[in-house]
Amino acid sequence: QAGPLPKPTLWAEPGSVISWGNSVTIWCQGTLEAREYRLDKEESPAPWDRQNPLEPKNKARFSIPSMTEDYAGRYRCYYRSPVGWSQPSDPLELVMTGAYSKPTLSALPSPLVTSGKSVTLLCQSRSPMDTFLLIKERAAHPLLHLRSEHGAQQHQAEFPMSPVTSVHGGTYRCFSSHGFSHYLLSHPSDPLELIVSGSLEDPRPSPTRSVSTAAGPEDQPLMPTGSVPHSGLRRHWE
């Protein structure tokens, strides 16, 4: 007796974070025995879509010509072979940016900071929002969420970094969002360049400090601990 069919691989091109109006292609790759591919979207009646495989039958393409709010969400795909349906793929979270106006990102006291000192990145939105995200360019896991505790709406979120090391240097952007959909984000803020000067220390602060970073800026996101003072926001990893 053969075991369950292996799960397919699901991904999006050019990526899973798409600006409103832009096109995106969702790919599902199974096996050469696949006869049909099915794409399901969380909280929608299934199947969300269905496609015949492309030669040599080991994958299928689901095209979204123009990204809108309706397409944002969590997807899984399956394929059908002569022996039945596969296990579901790991989920793909398709996020749309451009749902709200862009926030402003600033650094306090300054974007030029000496190594070992403290800096706070401040993300401010014009209208009250309950989720703020900080993105660092070229980070493998770039999303850091600050979410309000009880759905309370905030105009800003603070991302404190202390002590600062060379690892923290780089280009940041932030987004704001409403909690009713984690998949709808604002336009990105203008980029903020954080410049760390006078770095003489080992850029690997001990994990007991309030902000820890791993081997380098390409490897890990910022990982703050504890709650944000006076903001009513709570840190979450999604």
């Epitope: 399901d40 979207k41 909280e43 929608s44 009646p45 299934a46 199947p47 969300w48 879509d49 269905r50 309706d70």
Partner: nanobody, 121 residues
């Protein structure tokens, strides 16, 4: 060959109830979203309710709390239980089957012939 067939329409007084049925072939029923649209005279066809093979259901705001969609997998049949009917519910009701992506675009893969529901005051 008609692959989706509705029944159960008729004339009912305002405040009354009706149950529509839609029978489909096993192949269509087991692999598609099943749902109901309606089209009133001179108006655009609108999605009323739908149910997926995963059990997720969707309703138009105008029928929430009054209409219930259900599917009987043993009979390859989908039902629309309509309660507290009002004059505005008067329309031809169409059963449909297809993927959800097309459902929301009012272009499912399979359509029934339609059954008339008339609600009198």
């Amino acid at each position: 060959e008609v692959q989706v067939v509705e029944s159960g329409g008729g004339l009912v007084q305002a405040g009354g109830s009706l149950r529509l049925s839609c029978a489909a072939s096993e192949t269509i029923f087991s692999s598609n979203v099943m749902g109901w649209y309606r089209q009133a005279h001179g108006k655009q066809r609108e999605l009323v309710a739908a149910t997926g093979i995963n059990g997720v259901t969707k309703y138009a705001d105008s029928v929430k709390g009054r209409f219930t969609i259900s599917r009987d997998n043993a009979k390859n049949t989908v039902y629309l239980q309509m309660n507290s009917l009002n004059v505005e519910d008067t329309a031809v009701y169409y059963c449909a089957a297809g993927v959800w992506r097309n459902f929301v675009m009012r272009s499912p893969d399979y359509w029934g012939q339609g059954t008339q529901v008339t609600v009198s005051s």
